[in-house]
Interface confidence: low
Amino acid sequence: DPVLCFTQYEESSGKCKGLLGGGVSVEDCCLNTAFAYQKRSGGLCQPCRSPRWSLWSTWAPCSVTCSEGSQLRYRRCVGWNGQCSGKVAPGTLEWQLQACEDQQCCPEMGGWSGWGPWEPCSVTCSKGTRTRRRACNHPAPKCGGHCPGQAQESEACDTQQVCPTHGAWATWGPWTPCSASCHGGPHEPKETRSRKCSAPEPSQKPPGKPCPGLAYEQRRCTGLPPCPVAGGWGPWGPVSPCPVTCGLGQTMEQRTCNHPVPQHGGPFCAGDATRTHICNTAVPCPVDGEWDSWGEWSPCIRRNMKSISCQEIPGQQSRGRTCRGRKFDGHRCAGQQQDIRHCYSIQHCPLKGSWSEWSTWGLCMPPCGPNPTRARQRLCTPLLPKYPPTVSMVEGQGEKNVTFWGRPLPRCEELQGQKLVVEEKRPCLHVPACKDPEEEEL
């Protein structure tokens, strides 16, 4: 017959898990001994492994709830294609029966005694209730039994007495104004209110109780501004170390306005928070070196050549500068002491020239002497030869810029009778006197 085939068997519950499908034979399903099968949906689950006894079930409930009874448990032969120990076929149940006793005895009902006397009325004035009781001991119940009905009953009672009226407080009156206008001063501001024992007043006959508690109460005022606190100086702090390692410096003492801190609009401390003193390290300060301006470029020459002037032959020239003024272990000058560049020499070369535009007017000379004048020039500027602007001096070092150097001899057409420089002079007007500004202030 076809069965439902599953991929797992759960030992603890005896249930089939992981439905593979139906319509297969037991033999085909159980080609894998880890599988399990059911003959019908919801039916007994049998594992495909060789048969063995399941775990014992838990004991069934005891057959009676009191005195001695008995209870059953079972186990099942589960598996396929074989037998459990004792030559038992799969699906067979094996039972165990044992004696049990949930409770040794069975409950028995008891009987009531007669009613006891009425207790006093629950109140001492006006109307109340009174109660009487009976005991469950005639006979006493056994083994957890009880008596039917109630153990007490009540009825109304009247004391024939008028009740006294006890006092109760009327509502509180308004709060009085605060005793101060700010908090934090010498007296803590308070407000007070009172009430009367008049809602109702206690009766005289019979005498009622007075109202409990106090007829007035006080509380701290809230929402008041804090009282101003004037600031006070703390002590002078230590003198700060001299902040310099050479020459003169300035040390400082500080004090803080925190004895107390001014608060709530109170005035700040009067006077200075710092005082200073000069300190002397008696050590001269280092002076860093500074480069002089570059010297003149050396003549443009090429090694092993007597002269390269007026030729399209690049040479080299250098200029130097001096690091001056370094004292007391100051820094040396940064950068190169020598500057080298490539050049074409046009020293004393006759070159065709053209007149420049007028230069801007120069300064008035002499600035403090009589009749200062200013001048401007037009220069006969040489037209430089169109040599290559860059050269490759050493293989693999790339192109180097080449600069023209030297004083050529420019040739221009005469201008106003001049060949090299035309100069125009003008007097400087409205010349102020040279005065030392320091002396002017005195």
Partner: nanobody, 129 residues
Framework: QVQLMESGGGEVQAGGSLRLSCAAS????????MGWYRQAPGKQRELVAD???????QYADSVKGRFTISRDNAKNTVYLQMNSLKPEDTAVYTC???????????????????????WGQGTQVTVSG
């Protein structure tokens, strides 16, 4: 000696504009031409534009039509107006001045060699894409 002080550099989006200024002080009567150079990281320094004392100008091909060099002789200042900036214009821009004594008037030859004798410190121009 002549001292040169550049200003006006900064960061700008592509297509934006900047105006660089270079103020000269010191022996300004010795200045003939003034120019702007630029150097991008890992590249050779190149002339961007320059202007002679007479006002004649020249420009690198890559900036023609976008950059304008001008000069205010009264203030001893040269300006470089840079419009339609491109990311490839990112570089350090350095102002240079030519000494009349040293080099004479080279610009009339169109000579592109660095015959400048005085140089500024440089100002960074960054054009972000």
């Amino acid at each position: 000696q002549v001292q040169l002080m550049e200003s006006g550099g900064g960061e700008v989006q592509a297509g934006g504009s900047l105006r660089l200024s270079c103020a000269a002080s010191g022996s300004i009567f010795d200045i003939s031409a003034m120019g702007w150079y630029r150097q991008a990281p890992g590249k050779q320094r190149e002339l961007v534009a320059d202007i002679t004392s007479s006002g004649s100008t020249q420009y690198a091909d890559s900036v023609k039509g976008r950059f304008t060099i001008s000069r205010d002789n009264a203030k001893n200042t040269v300006y470089l107006q840079m419009n339609s900036l491109k990311p490839e214009d990112t570089a350090v821009y350095t102002c240079a001045a030519e000494s009349i004594r040293e080099s004479q008037n080279r610009h009339q030859l169109g000579y592109m060699g660095p015959l400048y004798d005085y140089w500024g410190q440089g100002t960074q121009v960054t054009v972000s894409g």
